[in-house]
Interface confidence: low
Amino acid sequence: TGADTEAVVCVGTACYTAHSGKLSAAEAQNHCNQNGGNLATVKSKEEAQHVQRVLAQLLRREAALTARMSKFWIGLQREKGKCLDPSLPLKGFSWVGGGEDTPYSNWHKELRNSCISKRCVSLLLDLSQPLLPSRLPKWSEGPCGSPGSPGSNIEGFVCKFSFKGMCRPLALGGPGQVTYTTPFQTTSSSLEAVPFASAANVACGEGDKDETQSHYFLCKEKAPDVFDWGSSGPLCVSPKYGCNFNNGGCHQDCFEGGDGSFLCGCRPGFRLLDDLVTCASRNPCSSSPCRGGATCVLGPHGKNYTCRCPQGYQLDSSQLDCVDVDECQDSPCAQECVNTPGGFRCECWVGYEPGGPGEGACQDVDECALGRSPCAQGCTNTDGSFHCSCEEGYVLAGEDGTQCQDVDECVGPGGPLCDSLCFNTQGSFHCGCLPGWVLAPNGVSCTMGPVSLGPPSGPPDEEDKGEKEGSTVPRAATASPTRGPEGTPKATPTTSRPSLSSDAPITSAPLKMLAPSGSPGVWREPSIHHATAASGPQEPAGGDSSVATQNNDGTDGQK
């Protein structure tokens, strides 16, 4: 399923778009990426409110969203193998577009420790509550979904697009309609700020086609950090309305001439810009000439200014912008140093955590410690890692090698271990015999029981019967459903394999088959090995079969 838009909020130097559609986190990121953005960051309370605003916009027009709880992907993810770090606000998660470990977080609940699979974060919206600024969406962490299974309850995602700057919305001085087309392929007629490189189409008039005039503008960078449309004077002006329509499209004051014409003006302390609509402060700092977090400091008599940088930054060659000082040059950390805007932080490799003597030191994480082991059974801690092991009768399984799966000894690589019936159980197996046979003390072979079975043409004669009663059948001619003697073809059953989970008694199979020549008077059982017990060990039904449990090492007894 694709993603539908769309709601847009542009503020500062970024635009946020909200989309509905059941996509995995990777598909959502790809969708944002195609238009030059990323899944949205929520790095501060202010940014959370911008994101909330765009979701509020989407939800008000999305009548289809009936779920009480809705989730929307954001760009916060933790890679497979990276463990939870409860000491950090982002708990070891990081923003998809990169960037520092930000201080703001709004987790829905305590996070479960896991380093095994990739985890992604969505915003959790309780649609039964009004979307007020005091109810900022909570962060919910979970699996990242896949194309076939996008993640439970995921209703959509939020993208963020960053720009060099924004233009003010175009001001109309009379009836008309503005349509903005943004670089991220969204059209809107109402944006609080319009991103650089957006196009604006203005259709003037009140819908009467004869009177309609069209204008086309592009939001351009007129000077460093100064963005405008290159239009002059209010658009769609009409002598009929004068200053009465939208204040003539003027930013501050509108002055009407007697002939219905009008001009825009500014209040004391402000000056009219080249667009003849917008007013800007005469204070040189009011145009925010300093960039990158630099503070504008007025010079004497308010004439000129200098830019000042916060701690951890220095002015670049333009003397307007602050650039980060790279503290990692001095190697202050034991393992990894991450330079962050205005500072740095030490990180530990996967399998280590901050700790030990000295600043930025790392110590091994004991993944096997009580309550945090990722292994289903045995866990061995190693320096910087761990490995899982399984008890006898189980092997490691799962994509991450942390689960244990029962070994089916009845279909083992060396062939079945029982001479007759074999029953697989959790972590073990046991052997059994068909009616008329009993299990030998070794728990593997079958011996003829006190009552023998006759051949299809009639029962064997008395001598034969007496001869076999109670004696162990030799290996070469053993009653083995699993393998015949060397050079002897295996007897095959004439019916389908009986299953222990079916209600049919096991004796319903044709048990009497003529033995191959060379072993007179010995009846071979059909090959019906691997009668796997469906839920724990079950006795074969019908007849006096005998069963013993067998360890993998060949000794009797249960594990």
Partner: antibody
Framework: QVQLQQSGAEVKKPGASVKVSCKAS????????MHWVRQAPGQGLEWIGE????????YYNQKFKGRVTMTRDKSTSTVYMQLSSLTSEDTAVYYC?????????????WGAGTTVTVSS | DIQMTQSPSTLSASVGDRVTITCKAS??????????MNWYQQKPGKAPKLLIY???NLESGVPSRFSGSGSGTEFTLTISSLQPDDFATYYC?????????FGGGTKLEIK
């Protein structure tokens, strides 16, 4: 300066509807939400609902849902509030007030009020 | 709905007096360190006027003798030295949750 200019007093019969207008000037109309608040004679203030003039989204107090409709005309920077199925309990002064778009939505500018009298 | 209870409902005082009006919310109106509580003044036949927003912030143009404090469920409006122009009705309002609700009002009259 920032002003909210409301329409004149209305007298209505029970069961009828009333439509009150509020014209904004002196600020960017689409940058603030517009709210409606009423005050019955000798009583306190009661919030009816709000409209976002930029996209025409509305939120209503559940108490008035089904009876109230808020609309806006961007070309004239005017917001309207229509209340239907009037009863004598709807006799009140109806105020429009603007609030910031997001954050603490306190009402920083108010209209002078429109008196609506419901009487048979 | 969040109920807002103001006390007293009527208060008699003289010019120069220090006056305190309290407002109690039926549940907290705080979120992420902010209090979504506002105070208005209303004179007969006039629209309300914003005095204090977010519990303690003075609206521009409002005299500094007005101040607000409190958090969670309990808030106060204080007039440090009553002036003749201050005799009016005062309302508290929460904007933390829909519906936005007002207190019943406190009428401040001349003693």
């Amino acid at each position: 300066q920032v002003q909210l200019q409301q329409s004149g007093a209305e007298v209505k019969k029970p069961g009828a509807s009333v439509k009150v207008s509020c014209k904004a000037s002196g600020y960017t109309f689409t940058s603030y939400w517009m709210h409606w608040v009423r005050q019955a004679p000798g009583q306190g203030l009661e919030w009816i609902g709000e409209i976002d003039p930029s996209a025409s989204y509305t939120y209503y107090n559940q108490k008035f849902k089904g009876r109230v409709t808020m609309t806006r005309d961007k070309s004239t920077s005017t917001v309207y509030m229509q209340l239907s199925s009037l009863t004598s309990e709807d006799t009140a002064v109806y105020y429009c007030a603007r609030s910031v778009y997001y954050g603490n939505k306190y009402f920083d500018v108010w209209g002078a009020g429109t008196t609506v009298t419901v009487s048979s | 709905d969040i109920q807002m209870t103001q006390s007293p409902s009527t208060l008699s005082a003289s010019v120069g007096d220090r006056v305190t009006i309290t407002c109690k919310a039926s549940q907290s109106v705080d979120y992420a360190g902010d209090s979504y509580m506002n105070w208005y003044q209303q004179k007969p036949g006039k629209a309300p006027k914003l005095l204090i927003y977010a519990a303690s912030n003075l609206e521009s143009g409002v005299p500094s003798r007005f101040s607000g404090s409190g958090s969670g469920t309990e808030f106060t409006l204080t007039i440090s030295s009553l002036q003749p122009d201050d005799f009016a009705t005062y309302y508290c309002q929460q904007t933390n949750e829909d519906p936005r609700t007002f207190g019943g009002g406190t009428k401040l009259e001349i003693k």
